[in-house]
Interface confidence: low
């Protein structure tokens, strides 16, 4: 599997990776104790046709051309987990794997 | 994880699967001896703030709003393989198993 | 106890090879990045490169094609293979493990070893 | 490639004294910045990670600010034992993971 790494400085159109931080913090969201932030990630680009495709589907689909099929889109083909210790609803201190809170690699489907 | 099944004659906006048969022989692909045809499926609708967000990570994304970023998309969010019988691209007969090949859910990422 | 325990260190002529040993303990090697930097005689710190937890490696520029990091999970043990040796090259070499920070693969580096000397001289 | 400068290359203060360290990076890495401390025949200890975040085991005293490239390593009350020198580091998780150090503070103690 491949995915392109982009940064703010990218003239790259196509689909990519991005660094992205999100500060827990500066949402306001004081049930998460721990990490206070973290390094997410997003997707964003343009889905030419057959470029990071990451499953035959996508081509099919688009060979098929159903009503409505918007053709592919960028997006996570890759995530990973981050533990985090927060508060649940009954104010208990929780400690857990959150799945896919950071973006490893970005497609096209 | 929930997802919205839809057909040809329903009138939903939002992000949902839709059924799909792809044809092989439709498309001239005459390397594949089998299935003929199959049951692939596809995504399509509109994602609304919050509707169908398979990740939190999503959420997180639309919280920080880099530039760029798109917001979520109707794609694939539980696939699965099919068996096929396929000529290689050596003339020789393969039997195996294709992952990705049917959407199973659609969600918005 | 949690320790990374480097080896292999020693003199070596400019132009030869040697490889460093990283032998961990009271963790799991593959669920963590490993990381190699080295420390020259009275001089800063600089990093070399990692390992990560899916096995991938990332060099420094300088370091790229002469050094090679790599793992042997049922030995518990990081490697670093350096060729073609140079005078700059003498420094302590330390091996390090990534902070397990509630975060996503951070290549800071929580728990290190003492470090091993390699002398580059004829 | 990012750059990260540190400074003052040396500073000596009294025991009790506020101590602030800077370093700054070539180009923005948002909160992605450690700060360690290394004495006389150790290897260095993680002291600060996203910029900000005490590593387990840190004293209060130390304290991590900043954002984008200009960060700042604050002692509040300057100890003996802190009589060490100071690395920044920064590590950037998207483009083949580059990590660059910063070339140090040595801080003593008069």
């Known amino acids: 599997d491949f995915g392109l790494d982009c940064d703010e400085h990218s003239t790259e159109s196509r689909c990519c990776r991005y660094p992205l931080t999100v500060d827990f913090e500066a949402f306001g969201w004081d049930w998460i104790i721990a990490p206070k932030r973290y390094k997410a990630n997003y997707c964003s680009g343009e889905c030419e046709f057959v470029f990071l495709q990451k499953y035959p589907h996508t081509h099919l689909v688009h060979q098929a051309n159903p009503r409505g099929s918007a053709g592919p889109c960028c997006t996570p083909t890759k995530m990973s987990p981050i533990n985090m210790l927060y508060f649940n609803g009954k104010e208990q201190i929780i400690y857990g794997k959150i799945p896919a809170m950071v973006v490893d690699r970005c497609g096209c489907s | 994880d929930f997802g919205l099944d839809c057909d040809e004659h329903s009138t939903e906006s939002r992000c949902c699967r839709y059924p799909l048969t792809v044809d092989f022989e439709a498309f001239g692909w005459d390397w594949i001896i089998a299935p003929k045809r199959y049951k692939a499926n596809y995504c399509s609708g509109e994602c609304e703030f919050v509707f169908l967000q398979k990740y939190p990570h999503t959420h997180l994304v639309h919280q920080a709003n880099p530039r760029g970023s798109a917001g979520p998309c109707c794609t694939p969010t539980k696939m699965s393989p099919i068996n096929m019988l396929y000529f290689n691209g050596k003339e020789q007969i393969i039997y195996g198993k294709i992952p990705a090949m049917v959407v199973d859910r659609c969600g918005c990422s | 106890e949690v320790q990374l325990v480097e080896s292999g260190g020693g003199l070596v002529q400019p132009g030869g090879s040697l490889r460093l040993s990283c032998a961990v303990s009271?963790?799991?090697?593959?669920?963590?990045?490993k990381g190699w930097v080295r420390q020259a005689p009275g001089k800063g710190l600089e990093w070399i490169g990692i390992i990560n937890i899916e096995g991938s490696t990332y060099y420094a520029s300088w370091a790229e094609g002469r050094f090679t990091i790599s793992r042997d999970n049922s030995k518990n043990t990081v490697y670093l293979q350096m060729n073609s040796l140079r005078a700059e090259d003498t420094a302590v070499y330390f091996c390090?493990?990534?902070?397990?920070?509630?975060?996503?693969?951070?290549?800071?580096?929580?728990?290190w070893g003492q470090g091993t000397l390699v002398t580059v001289s004829s | 490639a990012v750059v990260m400068t540190q400074s003052p290359a040396t500073l000596s203060l009294s025991p009790g004294e506020r101590v602030t360290l800077s370093c700054q990076a070539s180009e923005s890495i948002h909160h992605e910045l450690s700060w360690y401390q290394q004495k006389p025949g150790q290897p260095p200890k993680l002291l600060i990670y996203l910029a900000s975040t005490l590593a387990s085991g840190v004293p209060s005293r130390f304290k991590g600010s900043g954002s984008g490239t200009d960060f700042t390593l604050t002692i509040s009350s300057l100890q003996p034992e802190d009589a060490a020198t100071y690395y920044c580091?920064?590590?950037?998780?998207?483009?083949?993971?580059?990590?660059?150090f910063g070339q140090g503070t040595k801080v003593e103690i008069k």
């Open positions: 009271g963790f799991t090697l593959s669920h963590y990045v």
């Open positions: 580091q920064t590590y950037d998780g998207i483009s083949h993971y580059g990590v660059a």
């Open positions: 390090a493990r990534g902070h397990d920070n509630f975060g996503y693969s951070y290549h800071d580096f929580n728990l």
